[in-house]
Amino acid sequence: GSERTCCPVNWVEHERSCYWFSRSGKAWADADNYCRLEDAHLVVVTSWEEQKFVQHHIGPVNTWMGLHDQNGPWKWVDGTDYETGFKNWRPEQPDDWYGHGLGGGEDCAHFTDDGRWNDDVCQRPYRWVCETELDKASQEPPLL
């Protein structure tokens, strides 16, 4: 495979990763798939420094990240360990609130207007952030 050594047009480089910030909104699953089509993933926040970087770029707008608990436990989309990793939830979050009247609880995490995290209904059309790592060999699968 080939290694990506610089970020694509319209992406922002930071600490050996590339970030792309949407200016439109989609449901979490559609945002997740959008990132996958870019050979990326929804942003995975692993440090306070990365949190501040993303927060600076998105501003005070609800924005999806690559964290969900749709299958039970909270999981990062790239396999980063949730339990031992960085967290920045709002107080009393996540709460899997059922009172929104939309059916079910809240299974997808997003940045809130102050940057701290909240769980919300995955169908809400929020902005999103894609991330891909530099120097990661892109796996071009063999032809069948």
Partner: antibody, heavy 122, light 108 residues
């Protein structure tokens, strides 16, 4: 100039297989997700499958899932669609299309090939 | 899947006429709406994205509007080369993209 040229269509019996190819030129092929869209005779357009630029992520319409496989060879600027267990309802012109996108998050099919006809009949 | 419904399915118009085609989505798709033109025996041609943004090289007589579930494609002054089938397509559901059934614009 962006160009997409499909090939590999033809007449095949139900249950048979066929592999379509799409040769791309005029742009950095590996930077774009590529898709197949089909059109049955006298009918509208139906999205079939899409593949990310590296080939690492693939998606399929429910109507072809498990029967069709999309792939690409970036060194040859070529997209493929391997079709198996073909049915009469797969008869269509198959178009290769580039997934364009702009900075806000909107995407679209900005360039299309001329299409290749697949006829499934006994 | 999101269903896209166009109306009318066909229309007859004269050169110079103002033509409007509508497209309705089965659920809110914000502005994730594209328009394509297809002539007989040819591949579709990309016209408009994000409901109202013209693709490069598309004549300004074409315009799009709408958001949510209701959208329109307008040709301000129909030209001979505009007789074709027009399709809308939603790009909200990535990548479960769906098209309208098409609207045929014929010569009166």
């Amino acid at each position: 100039e962006v160009q997409l040229l499909e090939s590999g269509g033809g007449l095949v019996q139900p249950g048979g297989s066929l592999r379509l190819s799409c040769a791309a030129s005029g742009f950095t092929f590996s930077s774009y997700a590529m898709s197949w869209v089909r059109q049955a005779p006298g009918k509208g357009l139906e999205w079939v499958s899409v593949l990310s630029g590296s080939g690492g992520s693939t998606f399929y319409a429910d109507s072809v899932k498990g029967r069709f496989t999309i792939s690409r060879e970036n060194s040859k600027n070529t997209l493929y669609l391997q079709m198996s267990s073909l049915r009469a309802e797969d008869t269509a012109v198959y178009y290769c299309a580039r997934r364009g996108r702009e900075y806000s998050g909107y995407d679209y099919f900005d360039y299309w090939g001329q299409g290749t006809l697949v006829t499934v009949s006994s | 899947d999101i269903q896209m419904t166009q109306s009318p399915s066909s229309l007859s118009a004269s050169i110079g006429d103002r033509v409007t085609i509508t497209c309705r989505a089965s659920q809110n798709i914000s502005s994730y709406l594209n328009w394509y033109q297809q002539k007989p025996g040819k591949a579709p041609k990309f016209l408009i994205y994000a409901a109202s943004s013209l693709h490069s090289g598309v004549p300004p007589r074409f315009s799009g509007s709408g958001s949510g579930t209701d959208f329109t494609l307008t040709i301000s002054s129909l030209q001979p080369e505009d007789f074709a089938i027009y399709y809308c397509q939603q790009s909200y559901r990535t990548p479960l993209w769906t098209f309208g059934q098409g609207t045929k614009v014929e010569i009166k």
